[in-house]
Every structure is written in C-alpha cells, then in structure tokens.
C-alpha cells in the first residue's frame, strides 16, 4: 500500500479550501492537531480538521446531496409537470369544443330550443370540467340532469308548440315523465356509459400525472439523516483533513455510501416501475369509449339522435304525457 | 374519433380542427409521454449510480479515497467502508424509509391499483361481456323495442381529430359556430309529422 503523502505542515491548503465553504471563520487550525474531539474524520495522525469544521462539512455534504438529487430529477420533473399542464389545458379545450359543437347543433336544428338548451348544455359541460379536475360529481346524475332539463323544453317547444309558456308545475311533471317513460329511449344510457368511462379514465390519467409530480417533489426535498451526512462527509471531505485536496472517492465506495443514504428512496423503485407500466396500460386503452376526446366531441350527434327519437315517438308520448301530466296542466290554467 | 358532419361545421376554422389527421393529437401526445417516461423507469434504482457519476469520483486516477485512506483504485479496500466501527452501514439500511417516503409509496400503491383496475382487459372493472361500445349485446329494455348496437363496421373511427398543440389556444365560440347558411339535417320537402302536429292532437291543449 503506498504511504500517504505528508500532510501540509501548515494546514494552509486546507484553510484556503475551507474558506470557500465558510468565508471568514477561523475554524481551521494553523498547524495539524491531534483531533481527539473529531467524530467523523477520525485521524490516524495529526489532522487539519476541527470539530466545527467537521460539522460544517456534514452540513455541506447533505446540501450537496440534496442538490445532486434535485438535478438528477430535474428532467423527469419537468417532463411530468409540463405534460400535466398541457393535458389539463387540452382536456379543457376538448370540453369547450364539445360544448360549442352541441350548442351549434341546437342552433342549427332546433333554434326554438336554443336559449334554454344553451344554458343546460353549459351546466352539463361545466360539470364535466369539474369532474375531470376531481370534483365529487356523479356522471349519471349529470347526464340525467341534462335530459331532465331538456325534455320540458322539447315538449313545450317542439312537441306541443301551442302550449302557453310552461309553468313550474308542468315542468316538474315532465321531468318525472322523462325517466318513467324512457322518453329518450336508450340514448341517455349510452351517453352515461360513454361519458362516465371516458371521464373516469381521463381523471385518473391526470391524477396519476399529478401524483408523479408529488413523488418527484417528495424525493427531491428529502432531508438526509445524520448518519448519511457522516458517511458523505467521510467520503467527500475527510481526505481534506489529511491535506489530500485533489484525491477523489473510489467509485465502488461511492456506490456503497449512496445505496446506504438512499436505502429509503430506492424502496420507491418497485412502485415507480409499476406506476409507469400501469400508466402505459391505461394510455394504450384510451380509445373509443375510453377516449374523452372521441366521446365528448361526438356527444352533440348522440344528443341530436336522442331528440329525433323523441320526435319519432311524439304521438305516443304526447298521449301518455297528456294523461300523466293532465293534473298539473289543469292547475296551470286554473 | 368523433364524427364531424361537414354540413354542420362549414366554418373553415372548425373544419381545420375537425379534419386534421397528421398533426399531433392527444393520443399521440399521450403515447409520446409514456415513451419518455419509460426511459425513466429505472430512475430510483439508478439514483445511487447517477449521483456517484455526477459527483467527483476517481475514474482515471490510480489512487482513490475509501473514507479512511488512499488506496489503489482496483484494490479490495477501494470498495470497503474504511471505518467499519464508526457506524454500521447495514443498520442505516435497516432503518427503513422516512415517513414521507412511506406515505408516497402508499399513494403510489393506491394509484397503481386504480390504474390497473381501469385498464384491465375488456375494460375494465365490471364490464365483462360488454361489447366495444360498453353495452351488453342484448341490452334491451323490457318494455321497449330497443337495443344498443355493437360497434359494427367501423362505427367509431379510432382517430383523434383535435389538433393538439397547434390548436391549444384556439377557442371556438358559439357565435363562430357555423351553420347559419346550411341546415345540418335539412327536412324532407314537406314531410314532417311536426309541421302538422298542431292539427293532429294534443291532449294538453
């Protein structure tokens, strides 16, 4: 084994190095000392380190470690943050387009419904946006509310245009009749299925991206233990105490120390791998009724079909509703 | 992807959104993200090595520091912890992760469970025996002559048509919504049961 080079007789080199870490403080001995109070850089002979220096080295080592960790995750963190923002904005744009497509359909095909239809369509798509962002709304309720609101307007404006301005009484009866008589056939059910599946997947996709950011942030800002600080100090700075300024740690030794310091963080690995693979599976399945873009941008056409279905069955419906809501109607005219 | 009837969206701006095929779409962007994320799949297991390679370690030098003394880079002592008695590296590992790390692991477990549930083959959760549209083949109302049809021959084309980033700032207002000059569903000449509904019957009148 080669003999260690003789330590700097005056600790001058060590002082100039240490001054960079802690300018102005006179913690470096003028000449090598026994160092019996040292706890980390235990000397085999005289040393140029003091207890205070050792503490400063530990602090610096932990800070270095935190910075290294942050720079290690910078690219990954940026990737997820940027994509989470981009997808959230894109989903909002899809919702906005879907709303405008639906409004355009009403404006072009059912102008007599438009003022109220715009309002109900607006409320529906607001709920869609809120749901994607994590709001505790039931999708089936959203769809039911849309059709419950639309039917009285369709009935009074399209099916029975001669009726006086509808009053609350008949509207409530019509809302009830809408479900009891399956006025829109199976269209609401189709929309519920498609919207709930596509929005569920979209919501989980965004949740997963946001959790990804949280994972990186958590490991990014980890505070390393005192034990780790001591190991890092010994690896990075104890050589200075012997005046070995240009010597670097051995690679294998560094790996052992890092694995020790990061034992907790590395435990995330298994779940992180699973996270990426599960996210990939989800993304691979995001098509057809699991793709909110496909579903929401096609919603106007399904709503259009549902209104046509009502119109085709208008005869039967008008008779049945006439009997069902006659009481409300009489009260309205009284 | 969703079907956009030309006769409803005659505004050229909208057609641009509706019919772009080769530009970046949401689904292509999602796949691109996954490919990039997959390059980070070993991020946590590779961290110790990454940090060592980004902090000063002896690469070309003959001698290196093992925590206690200068040694030859390829000697057995190079990898060994020079101060075994100071504190035990094994103990440090045995302590287990910090509470914040345990917490984040629990959250990862939870989201992984959700992701798996959502992407089980055939979709997923309780959708066994469902056709591609998400309905059972015989999903007919008891008192209705109705069923939801299967996907059929290319019923929904799998092609996202929203221009992704290029259109991110583009907002289509209802006022822009085309169709003032052309009906989406022009009525047949005179054939409309509703034209005459007033005369047909209305039990509520």
């Amino acid at each position: 084994q080669p003999p260690p080079p003789p330590p700097d007789a005056t600790c001058h080199q060590v002082r100039s190095f240490f001054q960079r870490l802690q300018p102005g403080l006179k913690w470096v001995p003028e000449t090598p000392v026994p160092g019996s109070d040292l706890q980390v850089c235990l000397p085999k002979g005289p040393t140029c380190c003091s207890r205070k220096m050792e503490e400063k080295y530990q602090l610096t080592a932990r800070l270095n470690m935190e910075q290294l960790l942050q720079s290690a995750s910078m690219e990954l963190k940026f990737l997820i943050i940027q994509n989470a923002a981009v997808f959230q904005e894109a989903f909002e744009i899809v919702v906005r387009h879907a709303k405008n497509y639906t409004n355009a359909m009403f404006k072009n095909n059912y102008p007599s419904l438009t003022p109220q239809a715009f309002e109900f369509v607006g409320e529906f798509f607001t709920d869609v946006s809120l749901y994607i962002l994590g709001s505790d709304i039931n999708v089936d309720d959203m769809v039911n509310e849309l059709f419950d609101s639309l039917f009285p307007v369709i009935y009074t404006q399209l099916m029975n245009p001669g009726l006086p301005d509808s009053a609350l009484d008949i509207n409530e009866c019509l809302r009830g009749a809408r479900r009891d008589l399956k006025v829109f056939g199976n269209f609401p059910k189709l929309i519920m299925t498609q919207v709930s599946k596509s929005l569920q997947v979209t919501r989980i996709f965004l949740q997963a991206l946001n959790l990804g950011i949280e994972v990186i942030n958590t490991t990014d800002h980890l505070k390393f233990s005192k034990d780790c600080g001591r190991m890092l100090t010994r690896m990075w700075y104890c050589s200075y105490c012997q005046g070995l300024m240009m010597v670097k740690p051995c690679g294998g030794y560094c790996n052992v120390v890092m694995q020790g310091c990061m034992a907790g963080v590395v435990e995330i690995d298994k779940y992180w791998r699973e996270y990426i693979l599960s996210l990939e599976e989800l993304v691979n399945g995001m098509y057809r009724i699991y793709d909110m873009e496909n579903v929401l941008l096609g919603l106007f056409s399904t709503i259009h079909d549902s209104i046509q279905y009502v119109q085709k069955n208008a005869g039967k419906l008008t008779t049945t509703i006439g009997k069902l809501c006659a009481h409300s109607q009489q009260r309205q005219y009284r | 992807s969703a079907y956009y009837p030309e006769d409803l969206f005659i505004d050229k701006k909208v057609l641009k959104v509706a019919h772009v095929e080769h530009e970046e779409t949401l689904s292509s962007r999602r796949r691109e993200l996954i490919q990039k994320l997959k390059s980070f799949i070993s991020f946590y297991s590779a961290l110790p090595g990454y940090i060592c390679s980004h902090s000063p370690v002896a690469e070309n030098d003959t001698l290196c520091w093992n925590g206690q003394e200068l040694v030859e880079r390829y000697s057995q002592k190079a990898a060994r912890n020079g101060m075994k008695n100071q504190f035990n590296l094994h103990e440090l590992k045995m302590k287990g992760p910090e509470p914040v790390v345990s917490q984040i692991i629990d959250k990862l477990k939870h989201i992984n469970q959700l992701l798996r549930t959502m992407s089980m083959p055939k979709g997923r959760v309780l959708d066994k025996n469902l056709d591609e549209e998400g309905f059972e083949a015989g999903d007919c109302g008891d008192d209705e002559d109705e069923c939801i049809g299967g996907a059929g021959d290319g019923m929904i084309k799998v092609k996202n048509q929203l221009r992704f980033l290029a259109e991110l700032a583009y907002d289509l207002d209802v006022d822009d919504a085309p169709g003032n000059s052309q009906q989406a569903t022009p009525k047949d000449n005179e054939i409309s049961t509703f034209h005459n509904l007033g005369n047909v019957h209305s039990p509520l009148k």
Partner: antibody, heavy 119, light 107 residues
C-alpha cells in the same frame, strides 16, 4: 337525389348467416335513421328495426331480436343487416328505408334484396 | 304493438272509377297514419302521411281521411299506373306496423 342501393340476392343454407348492405347517397348519412323491412312473397311489410348511424343505437321489433343485427359504417355511408340462424321462414325480400328526422315515415327505399333459404 | 287491419284484401276496378280502401287500428293513433303504394317487384312509395297530407309529386286524385282508429284512402278516377298493392302504416311510435295490404287489380 337520395338513393339507397342494396346488395344483390342471397342464397343461403339453413343455419347459415347472411349480411345485407344498403349504401346511402344524396344526403348526410348520419342525419337520419335507417330502417329495415321484411316482405315475404305475396305478403305485407314488417318493420325489423332501425339504426341511428351517428351513435350506432339500434331499436328492434321484438319479433326480430336475436335474428337481425343492424350496424352502420359512417365512413362508407352504408348500413348493414345480418340475419343469423336462417330458416326457410326467413326467405323474403328485405328493404332498407330512410326515415324523416321526426317520424317513422319512409319516403326513400332501397330496391330490396331477395334472400332465399334452401337446403 | 298496434294491429293494423286493412280491407278489402283485394279489389278489382276499372280505369276512371273511384275506389276506397280502409284501415282500422287496434288503438287510437290520432292522425299518425301513412299510406304506401307498391307495384309488383318494386319498393313501396309514400302516398300520404299524417292521415291526409300528400308529399310533393303525389297526384291529387289520391286523398286520405280519418283519425283515431278508422282511416281511408280514396283514389278518384283510377289511372292505369294506380294498379298495385296499397299498405297503411302508423307512425305513432315504435314499432311502426303495416296493414296486411290491399291488392288493386284491373277489372
């Protein structure tokens, strides 16, 4: 002008399936429902069911559930009807017809497809 | 389902005559009734809807009447091209049903 072009005559064995097509032109395919009718030789018309090409939702006459399956391909503006487990009872002319947007009225019809089921 | 009963099942008439075909429904369908004409080997053609409305292009010698459960189709001054089969159909709701048909032959 509105046209519905149906596929040619089919000869099938009992137990087999056939798939009839109805190609629409002259209007926006997704704006109207397509209905299918059956007419046995020298008899009246029976409504089998209809499909809304936009959403793919179908409505069937109770009598034809399990016998007929309606689908539509928007890209080719074509509606299809598959008849399964054929028996001699299914020998008939099958028509597709386009309705109006607000009623079960059929102003436009295909020319009909003769299906003959014979061993 | 609503049952449609047409009568007569067949009738013979000469060119220039007036004929009436009737259709009875099993329940009140108000005015939601259509009539179709079908010639041998051809597809049906819509003649009347909403019980009495003629689509564009249908000659005025055809007229429909009735409401509720009783309906009729009247053809004034029969022309050679009027011979064939006639079907009534309700468009009151799902499922639409057709009558058994009336075969109109040249005497």
């Amino acid at each position: 002008q509105v046209q519905l072009q149906q596929s040619g005559a089919e000869l099938a064995r009992p137990g087999a399936s056939v798939k009839l097509s109805c190609r629409a032109s002259g209007y926006t395919f997704t704006s109207y429902g397509i209905s299918w009718m059956m007419q046995r030789t020298g008899q009246g018309l029976e409504w089998i069911g209809e499909i809304y090409p936009r959403s793919g939702i179908t409505y069937y006459n109770e009598k034809f559930k399990g016998k007929a399956t309606l689908t539509a391909d928007k890209s080719s503006s074509t509606a299809y009807m598959q008849l399964s487990s054929l028996t001699s009872e299914d020998s008939a002319v099958y028509f597709c017809a386009r309705d109006v947007s607000d009623g079960y009225l059929f102003p436009y019809w295909g020319q009909g497809t003769l299906v003959t089921v014979s061993a | 389902d609503i049952q449609m009963t047409q009568s007569p099942a067949s009738l013979s008439a000469s060119v220039g005559e007036t004929v009436t075909i009737t259709c009875r429904t099993s329940e009140n369908i108000y005015s939601y009734l259509a009539w179709y004409q079908q010639k041998q080997g051809k597809s049906p053609q819509l003649l009347v809807y909403n019980a009495k409305t003629l689509p564009e292009g249908v000659p005025s010698r055809f007229s429909g009447s009735g409401s509720g459960t009783q309906f009729s189709l009247k053809i004034n001054s029969l022309q050679p091209e009027d011979f064939g089969s006639y079907y009534c159909q309700h468009h009151y709701g799902t499922p639409p049903t057709f009558g058994g048909g009336t075969k109109l032959e040249i005497k």
